[in-house]
């Protein structure tokens, strides 16, 4: 893996220490020939969680175009999911316009959908 990236199970991961909105985070990953992390299994979930710590962090899952989709095209419906209870809820009550279209790790690793413009940390992934 490149310097400052961490290898696990055939992928390399980079963990940010600053925050960006989801679209900017995905663009950052793309500039590194990577994408926001696609969580494919319980073991990968735990690995990422260990490195991220108890911090909100964007992952490569969005429903901005309708159904939930992983950024690399991995099938969402048949794949791994770790939503927190009652999530995703596309909550409009924040009063900031629209619902919640981007997924992130919460403090305990469970997933939540949130406004894509929130400046959360993020995780990039690329194949080794």
């Amino acid at each position: 893996c490149p310097v400052n990236w961490v290898g696990y199970e055939g992928s390399c991961y980079w963990f940010s220490r600053s925050g960006k909105p989801w679209p900017e985070a995905e663009k950052y990953c793309q500039l590194e020939n990577a994408h926001l992390v696609v969580v494919g299994s319980w073991e990968e979930q735990k690995f990422i969680q260990h490195h991220v710590g108890p911090v909100n962090s964007w992952i490569g899952l969005t429903d901005q175009s309708g159904p939930w989709k992983w950024v690399d095209g991995t099938d969402y419906e048949s794949g791994f999911k770790n939503w927190r209870p009652e999530q995703p809820d596309d909550w409009y009550g924040h009063g900031l316009g629209g619902g919640e279209d981007c997924a992130h790790f919460t403090e305990d690793g469970g997933w939540n959908d949130d406004i894509c413009q929130r400046p959360y940390r993020w995780v990039c992934e690329t194949q080794r």
Partner: antibody, heavy 117, light 107 residues
Framework: QVQLVQSGAEVKKPGASVKVSCKAS????????LHWVRQAPGQGLEWMGW????????NYAQKFQGRVTMTRDTSISTAYMGLSSLRSDDTAVYYC??????????WGQGTLVTVSS | DIQMTQSPSSVSASVGDRVTITCRAS??????LAWYQQKPGKAPKLLIY???SLQSGVPSRFSGSGSGTDFTLTISSLQPEDFAIYYC?????????FGPGTKVDIK
């Protein structure tokens, strides 16, 4: 050595609730997820969900959502599994099990819950 | 949900025999599969994790292989204490699911 010690057998009437405990020792309780698995008499194994003892976060199998509650008390390194609105087909041995690498590496001895009128 | 199937459902064998049990997942689970042994009235015991890694303290006559959808547990030389039910379990995604079990009994 790692040990998970569960509470004793219970007999409940249909519609009642039960709460099973699982006391952990031999490792740092808050470092590992704990799962609950049940096994009806003469049947196979069925995963019910997990709790993260550090955060209290849970993930329940859809089949049990609305009836199961998993909690923990970190001060005594104990996890609990509550199941409500019991039916006769909830009669089973209930196990707690520690999360390992793609597995459950340590199991409690099991708690038999019998639901009978 | 990912469905797990096992074959055979039961096998009669003698001490010293080589026994092979197969497990199939309804969709790919990489190598995230475990094997357990269960004896009557006891909790399951972990034998193999990550499809092929031997759990500490488990005899080396047990081995596992496979990836994706097809997996195998092999007992190279069956011992008297090995007569039990064996379950596979996928730990790739929720809900975690188990195979129906394979009973290994004395011929």
């Amino acid at each position: 050595q790692v040990q998970l010690v569960q509470s004793g057998a219970e007999v409940k009437k249909p519609g009642a609730s039960v709460k099973v405990s699982c006391k952990a020792s031999g490792y740092t309780f808050t470092d590992y997820y704990l799962h609950w698995v049940r096994q009806a008499p003469g049947q196979g194994l069925e995963w019910m969900g997990w709790i993260h003892p550090n955060s209290g976060g849970t993930n329940y199998a859809q089949k049990f959502q609305g009836r199961v509650t998993m909690t923990r008390d970190t001060s005594i390194s104990t996890a609990y599994m509550g199941l409500s609105s019991l039916r006769s087909d909830d009669t089973a041995v209930y196990y707690c099990a520690r999360d390992g690498t793609s597995s459950f590496d340590y199991w409690g001895q099991g708690t038999l819950v019998t639901v009978s009128s | 949900d990912i469905q797990m199937t096992q074959s055979p459902s039961s096998v009669s064998a003698s001490v010293g025999d080589r026994v092979t049990i197969t497990c199939r997942a309804s969709q790919g689970i990489s190598r995230w599969l475990a094997w357990y042994q269960q004896k009557p009235g006891k909790a399951p015991k972990l034998l193999i994790y990550g499809a092929s890694s031997l759990q500490s303290g488990v005899p080396s006559r047990f081995s596992g292989s496979g990836s994706g959808t097809d997996f195998t547990l092999t007992i190279s030389s069956l011992q008297p204490e090995d007569f039990a039910i064996y379950y596979c379990q996928q730990a790739n995604s929720f809900p975690f699911t188990f195979g129906p079990g394979t009973k290994v009994d004395i011929k």
